[in-house]
Interface confidence: medium
């Protein structure tokens, strides 16, 4: 019989008392064979973290800084449930640490040296740890003691709770550095007052501080936020201009065998019965014998953290960077005038081989990182393990939702000014065998389908989006009798046609022979009725252009396109017979890497791009024998985006809307995780 007990870790006598009350009250609202609570008392949160890792307890609620400690080896805990604040309709699980300045002050984030700073308090998240962690590498050496380095960086500060005797500059703007509300510049409101009064030039607070202190929009308009990319934004654009996004209070559990579903079942029932305004006899978010016992008193409920989310993703790149800098005293980034090597993310074995070859040829400018799926690559770029990769539009959408930005676009047409002229896009088409003469767009039900991969543009988002509008449900595996859509659930009928062996069957990488444009076309040739690909796929794999045994004798004339009006046309008439225009593949990266990725890739394509005439004896960046490794093989150059530098602008309103409509059918665990951080 599986153990259905959740052992909650308490860190004080008062918490233990509340935990016992929690345990007793839950017995009446959960079935006797359902989850139950047991209480484990430890001396501190760190002891709780160790106890959970050692399987002596199962759960505890932690602030962000402790979530980071819990994630570090050997603890390896993960966030499983988040407290939320505000309303159920608009639940807030995160706050944003921001740098507020007066509108007319005219300096940027990289010009803070010599300015006067206002902090909520020494050692506090938004007011100290995050800004000082992110500025750590700009601090004058020696950086220890930290307070001295900070004092020498700013020309004067108010950092309540600092030692005014040892570090008088930190108390220059608030004599005495008092560590309570007796100090008018203490806490969030105090730090903002320090800026407002003109004592300081910048205040490090949370996003809500300015709204709580200035009810009038006209007053708020006198202030701006400093962004990490050295721009400024209005104070209400904090979601796009902050130092870090910080989770408020989170339940953690073991990464393996952590009972996360059981913990959620328990807490979901708990909030149903003992949440805000539910019960007089016991209240989950109330602490009669103290403050914030087990859970924050200000919490309104719980949300399940998506399973794909580990602590690094949950805490976010900026927060992890700040805390790691402070804890480890490391400075990972090189000086801004010199770019570190770009860590390219390669999918599985074949891409890794090409990437390694690129790395050798680049003489250290490119390094390679491997992952098994595109989503794993995106996650690695998010958390800094990798820096960049080129993505199909469908994944540009997911990457964008995860905070990454497009930096260069693949161009497929030869032109004099290739690098300066990003193209409008390519065509998504539906290809059938000419011999299957009765097949049209209107009678695809029950047929065998071939897709590049789930979540990709031509192979999935466009055809399935159109299909969804017609059938009004997501059961595409029931619409087609069988198919190959790499990335589908292994037991789905949309994996039945795939050819990968063993664990590689239906995997969304080149280990699955029917993956990608060429793979989907091969699936049509060998097994399927219809393939959803790009307009260049058929000509690129027929007429002897693909020497592989399955393709070498194929003739373009043996294939036709399905048009949306129910007619069919020859392959070359794609401009008048396609499903939609698809945005070109694009290179994505983190915002902080944008300039360096742009610079290094421009250099690399000048060395190894289309200007290389002999690819048999030289490394060619855009060639891989029709396998589309790292980049599409028909790439002519990587083009500047000009002002299309966000995922929405790059993909275009129409495509973003189409993918948004398909969201309800999404099986992307990463998209679910990223929309949890930014709904």
């Amino acid at each position: 019989v599986p153990d259905k007990t959740v052992r909650w870790c308490a860190v004080s006598e008062h918490e233990a008392t509340k935990c016992q009350s929690f345990r007793d009250h839950m017995k009446s609202v959960i079935p006797s064979d359902g989850p139950s609570v047991a209480c484990v008392k430890k001396a501190s949160y760190l002891d709780c973290i160790r106890a959970i890792a050692a399987n002596e307890a199962d759960a505890v609620t932690l602030d962000a800084g402790l979530v980071y400690d819990a994630y570090l080896a050997p603890n390896n805990l993960k966030p499983v449930v988040a407290e939320f604040y505000g309303s159920k309709e608009d639940p807030q699980t995160f706050y944003y640490a921001v740098a507020v300045v007066k509108k007319d002050s005219g300096f940027q984030m990289n010009q803070l040296r010599g300015k006067k700073s206002c902090h909520t308090g020494l050692g506090r998240s938004a007011g100290w740890n995050i800004p000082i962690g992110l500025l750590y590498c700009d601090l004058p050496e020696p950086r220890k003691p930290l307070e001295k380095a900070v004092a020498n960086f700013f020309s004067g500060s108010c950092a309540p709770c600092a030692d005014g005797t040892d570090f008088p500059q930190l108390c220059q703007l608030c004599p005495g550095c008092g560590c309570s509300t007796l100090n008018q510049y203490f806490g969030y409101s105090g730090a903002f007052k320090c800026l407002k009064d003109g004592a300081g030039d910048v205040a490090f607070v949370k996003h809500s501080t300015i709204f709580e202190n200035l009810a009038n929009k006209a007053d708020r308009d006198q202030y701006e936020l400093l962004c990490l990319d050295n721009t400024r934004k209005p104070v209400d654009e904090y979601k796009d201009c902050h130092l870090a996004q910080v989770p408020s209070h989170t339940v953690v559990a073991r990464s393996m065998g952590g009972k996360e579903d059981l913990i959620w079942e328990l807490l979901n029932q708990a909030q149903e019965h003992f949440g805000k305004d539910k019960s007089k006899e016991f209240q989950l978010f109330s602490s009669p014998h103290g403050k914030d016992l087990l859970f924050k008193d200000s919490a309104h409920g719980f949300l399940k953290v998506p399973p794909r989310m580990d602590a690094k993703m949950y805490l976010g790149y900026e927060y992890v960077t700040a805390i790691r800098n402070l804890r480890e005293g490391t400075c990972p980034e090189a000086p801004t005038d010199e770019c570190k090597p770009v860590k390219w993310c390669a999918l599985s074995h074949h891409e890794r081989l090409k990437c390694d070859e690129w790395s050798v040829n680049s003489v250290g400018k490119i390094e390679c990182v491997s992952a098994e799926t595109t989503e794993d690559c995106i996650a690695k770029i998010m958390n800094g393990e990798a820096d960049a990769m080129s993505l199909d539009g469908g994944f540009v959408y997911i990457a964008g939702k995860c905070g990454l930005v497009p930096v260069l676009a693949e161009n497929y047409n030869k032109s004099d000014n290739c690098e300066d002229t990003p193209e409008a896009g390519y065509f998504a088409i539906a290809v059938v065998k000419k011999s299957a003469s009765d097949l049209t767009w209107d009678n695809l039900k029950g047929k065998k389908s071939c897709h590049t991969a789930v979540g990709r543009t031509a192979g999935w988002n466009i055809p399935m989006g159109l299909l969804y509008n017609k059938i009004n449900h997501c059961r595409f595996d029931e619409f087609f009798s069988e198919g190959c859509a790499p990335g589908s659930k292994k037991d789905s009928s949309l994996c039945k046609l795939c050819m990968g062996s063993g664990l590689n069957l239906c995997e969304p990488n080149n280990k699955e022979g029917y993956y990608g444009y060429t793979g989907a076309f091969r699936c049509l040739v060998e097994k399927g009725d219809v393939a959803f690909v790009k307009h260049q796929t058929v000509p690129q794999n027929t007429g002897g252009k693909n020497p592989d045994p399955w393709a070498k004798n194929l003739n373009e004339k043996d294939y036709e396109l399905l048009c949306l009006d129910g007619t069919r046309k020859p392959v070359e008439e794609y401009a008048n017979c396609h499903l939609a225009r698809a945005p070109n593949h694009a290179v994505v990266t983190r915002k902080d890497k944008e300039a360096c990725v742009h610079k290094i890739l421009r250099q690399q394509q000048h060395l190894f791009g289309s200007n290389v005439t002999d690819c048999s004896g030289n490394f060619c960046l855009f060639r891989s024998e029709t396998k589309d490794l790292l980049f599409r093989d028909d790439t002519v150059c990587l083009a500047k985006l000009h002002d299309r530098n966000t995922y929405e602008k790059y993909l275009g309103e129409e495509y973003v809307k189409a993918v948004g409509n398909l969201r309800k059918c999404s099986t992307s665990s990463l998209l679910e995780a990223c929309t949890f951080r930014r709904p």
Epitope: S32, D261, W264
Partner: nanobody, 128 residues
């Protein structure tokens, strides 16, 4: 209005398999106990299998453990019961049920008294 609609019942030989489906509509799926109950001719309601929707625990009656599997598809708001190695004593009308709201529990998850939304039932007959 919350509705549960069962399907998949029928006549099957001993040792055979059937898969029952229960489509839920009219409420936010996830975060409730939902399960399968059965009533054999002349007998009372018996709990067969229950799960906590949205990826939670599963619960089975001893008589079906190892033979029946309860599962869900969140995207379709649908609950399933895969019944293998069927026996004559499994013959019954199978009902899908949902425990909505704040009903107090002093009983097991397989106790029909805690469930307040019921489907119309689907007949399963196991006979050679």
């Amino acid at each position: 209005e919350v509705q549960l609609v069962e399907s998949g019942g029928g006549l099957v030989q001993p040792g055979g398999s059937l898969r029952l489906s229960c489509a839920a509509s009219g409420h936010a799926y996830g975060g409730n106990y939902m399960g399968w109950f059965r009533q054999a001719p002349g007998k009372g309601l018996e709990g067969v299998a229950v799960l906590y929707t949205g990826g939670g625990s599963t619960y089975y009656a001893d008589s079906v453990k190892g033979r029946f599997t309860i599962s869900e598809d969140n995207s379709k708001n649908t609950l399933y019961l895969q019944m293998n190695s069927l026996r004559a004593e499994d013959t019954a009308v199978y009902y899908c049920a949902l425990a909505l709201g704040s009903a107090r529990w002093y009983t097991s998850s397989l106790d029909a008294r805690a469930y307040n939304i019921w489907g119309q039932g689907t007949l399963v007959t196991v006979s050679s």
